[in-house]
Interface confidence: low
C-alpha cells in the first residue's frame, strides 16, 4: 500500500476506562496531530478507519462493528463501546485516507476493574480546593456525549466507599459536589456514578477524582524568607567550611513558579570561580504550602571569600524578595606567647 | 482606622421591604466578608448571613434565607441587607461585622458598623 | 443547629473582683483540622458589640491581658482576674466551627 504519515503510538493518551462501562474514544487525530477537523476531512471525501491490536499480539486487526447490540461502534470521529469488555484492552489506531492521502495514529486504552469501593489501577485527577474559601465544587469529569441533554441521569456521590448524604459540608447537587467550606478533613477520593437509559439498557459510568485541600489565595503572602535573617552571624576561620541555608516559606498559589537562589557579590554562582555547592530540600505543609531550603557551601573558605555578600533571594507570583546572610571572619583568639607578648613589648 | 458606616434608623409598615447599607472604609474591602447579625430588643445576636465581597458568594442561615438579601457594591465598598416582607418579628437592631479571611467568619468579627435600628409598625 | 448555653445569665460583681462566665456548647466546636472556633464578644450598654477572644484563647488587639479564655471541646470559660468599670455589660459566646453561627443567650455583668 502507499505511504502512510505514521504518528507512531501516542503514548502521552494512555486511555483507562472502567470494565463493563460506555467509553466513548475520539480519534486524536483531529486533537493533536492535523490541522483540521473530522467535518472537515469528512466532506473532502476522507474516510476515518479504526483497527486495534490486541494486549500481547503483534497483529493488526479490523474491529468487529457486528457485535451483538453494537457493543462497538462509531460515529463520526468517535468510537464506541456499549460496554467495555476487559479484554478490549490494547492498542487502536485510527486512520484516515483516501486515494493520495493517508495519516494514522496508535495509542493505547485500558480496561481496568474497580472493586465495591472504588479502587482500581485507574490514575486520579486531581482537583485542589482552597481551604476554608467559600462554596467551592467539583464537577463529574468526562461524561459529555454519553446521553443527549433530552435524558436526565441519576448520580450518586460517594467519598471513598460511603455514599455522601447529610454530610457537615458536602453537599451532592446533580453533576456538582458542593463544599461549603472545605477543610483538611475533605481531603480523599470522591466518585460520581452516572446512571443514564439507552434504548432499554442501563448504563453506569464511574469517574473518581482525588480532592487536595490547599492554601487560600486570600491568606497568601509573598516568599518569606526564615533564613538568613539580621539576627544570625555567619563567622568563620580561613579553612574552616562554609554552609549558609536560605530556608524560604512559599503560600501555596495555583500554577505559582516557586524560585530561590544565592548571588555571591551581585552574581550566580555559576558565574563565579569560587568552589560552591547548592544543595535544595522542598518540604510541604498540609495545605500544599511550601517550604525551600537552599544550603549554600563552600568547603574551605578563604579570607577573601568572607569579605564577600551572600544574598539569599526568593521569587513566586505574589513577590521578590531578598535578604543577605552576615557572614564575617573570625578574629583569632590570642596566643599569648606571642601575640601579647609582642603587645606588651617583649622581644 | 477600619470603619463600618451604617445607615440610618427605618421606620416600615408591615409587608413592606427595606435595604440597609454598610460602607466600608479603612481596608481592602474585597479581602474580607462582611456578616449580618440581629439583634432583637433586649436579646440576643443571631447571625443572619454572610458575602465574600471579592467573589459575591453569600452564605445564609436558613431561618433568614427567604427573609435576607445580602449584596455588594465594590465600588463604593457598601454592603447592603435587603429584608422583605416585613413583620413586627423583624423589627430588631441591623449589624454589620467584618469577618476574617474564613469564609464564615470563624475566628470573630474584629469590626462592627454602629447598628441600624428597624422598627416594623403600622 | 448548635445551641449554646452561658451562665449564669447575670453576675453581679464588686470592682477589683475576679468574675467568670462558663458557656457550653450542645456539640463539641472542634473541627477536623483542629481549630475549635469559640469567641467571645462584649456589647457594652448602648454599643455595638466589640470582639474580645477569638479560637477560644486568642485576645483580639487591645484587650487587656487581665481577661483569658479556656476550654475545649463543648466547654469553655471567660475569667476576668479583677473587674474594672469599663468591663459592665452583656458578655456573649459564640460558636464558628458548625454551620450556622450560633451565639449564648448572654451574661449581664453589672455591679453588685
Known amino acids: 500500500s502507499e505511504r502512510c504519515d505514521d504518528w507512531g503510538l501516542d503514548t502521552m493518551r494512555q486511555i483507562q476506562v472502567f470494565e463493563d462501562e460506555p467509553a466513548r474514544i475520539k480519534c486524536p487525530l483531529f486533537e493533536h496531530f492535523l490541522k483540521f477537523n473530522y467535518s472537515t476531512a469528512h466532506s473532502a471525501g476522507l474516510t476515518l478507519i479504526w483497527y486495534w491490536t490486541r494486549q500481547d499480539r503483534d497483529l493488526e486487526e479490523p474491529i468487529n462493528f457486528r457485535l451483538p447490540e453494537n457493543r462497538i461502534s462509531k460515529e463520526k470521529d468517535v468510537l464506541w463501546f456499549r460496554p467495555t469488555l476487559l479484554n478490549d484492552t490494547g492498542n487502536y489506531t485510527c486512520m484516515l485516507r483516501n486515494t493520495t492521502y493517508c495519516s494514522k495514529v496508535a495509542f493505547p486504552l485500558e480496561v481496568v476493574q474497580k472493586d465495591s469501593c472504588f479502587n482500581s489501577p485507574m490514575k486520579l485527577p486531581v482537583h485542589k480546593l482552597y481551604i476554608e474559601y467559600g462554596i467551592q465544587r467539583i464537577t463529574c469529569p468526562n461524561v459529555d456525549g454519553y446521553f443527549p441533554s433530552s435524558v436526565k441521569p441519576t448520580i450518586t456521590w460517594y467519598m471513598g466507599c460511603y455514599k455522601i448524604q447529610n454530610f457537615n459540608n458536602v453537599i451532592p447537587e446533580g453533576m456538582n459536589l458542593s463544599f461549603l467550606i472545605a477543610l483538611i478533613s475533605n481531603n480523599g477520593n470522591y466518585t460520581c456514578v452516572v446512571t443514564y437509559p439507552e434504548n432499554g439498557r442501563t448504563f453506569h459510568l464511574t469517574r473518581t477524582l482525588t480532592v487536595k485541600v490547599v492554601g487560600s489565595p486570600k491568606n497568601a503572602v509573598p516568599p518569606v524568607i526564615h533564613s538568613p535573617n539580621d539576627h544570625v552571624v555567619y563567622e568563620k576561620e580561613p579553612g574552616e567550611e562554609l554552609l549558609i541555608p536560605c530556608t524560604v516559606y512559599f503560600s501555596f498559589l495555583m500554577d505559582s513558579r516557586n524560585e530561590v537562589w544565592w548571588t555571591i557579590d551581585g552574581k550566580k554562582p555559576d558565574d563565579i570561580t569560587i568552589d560552591v555547592t547548592i544543595n535544595e530540600s522542598i518540604s510541604h505543609s498540609r495545605t500544599e504550602d511550601e517550604t525551600r531550603t537552599q544550603i549554600l557551601s563552600i568547603k574551605k573558605v578563604t579570607s577573601e571569600d568572607l569579605k564577600r555578600s551572600y544574598v539569599c533571594h526568593a521569587r513566586s507570583a505574589k513577590g521578590e524578595v531578598a535578604k543577605a546572610a552576615k557572614v564575617k571572619q573570625k578574629v583569632p583568639a590570642p596566643r599569648y606567647t606571642v601575640e601579647l607578648a609582642c603587645g606588651f613589648g617583649a622581644t | 482606622e477600619v470603619q463600618l458606616q451604617q445607615s440610618g434608623p427605618e421606620l416600615e409598615k408591615p409587608g413592606a421591604s427595606v435595604k440597609i447599607s454598610c460602607k466600608a472604609s479603612g481596608y481592602s474591602f474585597t479581602g474580607y466578608n462582611m456578616n449580618w447579625v440581629k439583634q432583637s430588643n433586649g436579646k440576643s445576636l443571631e447571625w443572619i448571613g454572610n458575602?465574600?465581597?471579592?467573589?459575591?458568594?453569600?452564605s445564609y442561615n436558613q431561618k433568614f434565607k427567604d427573609k435576607a438579601t445580602l449584596t455588594v457594591d465594590k465600588s463604593s465598598s457598601t454592603a447592603y441587607m435587603q429584608l422583605k416582607s416585613l413583620t413586627s418579628e423583624d423589627s430588631a437592631v441591623y449589624y454589620c461585622?467584618?469577618?476574617?479571611?474564613?469564609?464564615?467568619?470563624?475566628?470573630?468579627?474584629?469590626?462592627w458598623g454602629q447598628g441600624t435600628t428597624l422598627t416594623v409598625s403600622s | 443547629d448548635i445551641v449554646m448555653t452561658q451562665t449564669p445569665l447575670t453576675l453581679s460583681v464588686t470592682i477589683g473582683q475576679p468574675a467568670s462566665i462558663s458557656c457550653k456548647s450542645s456539640q463539641s466546636l472542634l473541627d477536623s483540622a483542629g481549630k475549635t472556633y469559640l469567641n467571645w464578644l462584649l456589647q457594652r450598654p448602648g454599643q455595638s458589640p466589640k470582639r474580645l477572644i477569638y479560637l477560644v484563647s486568642k485576645l483580639d488587639s487591645g484587650v487587656p491581658d487581665r481577661f483569658t479564655g479556656s476550654g475545649s471541646g463543648t466547654d469553655f470559660t471567660l475569667k476576668i482576674s479583677r473587674v474594672e468599670a469599663e468591663d459592665l455589660g452583656v458578655y456573649y459566646c459564640w460558636q464558628g466551627t458548625h454551620f450556622p453561627l450560633t451565639f449564648g443567650a448572654g451574661t449581664k455583668l453589672e455591679l453588685k
Open positions: 461585622a467584618r469577618g476574617d479571611v474564613h469564609y464564615y467568619g470563624y475566628e470573630g468579627f474584629d469590626y
Open positions: 458575602i465574600d465581597p471579592y467573589f459575591g458568594g453569600t
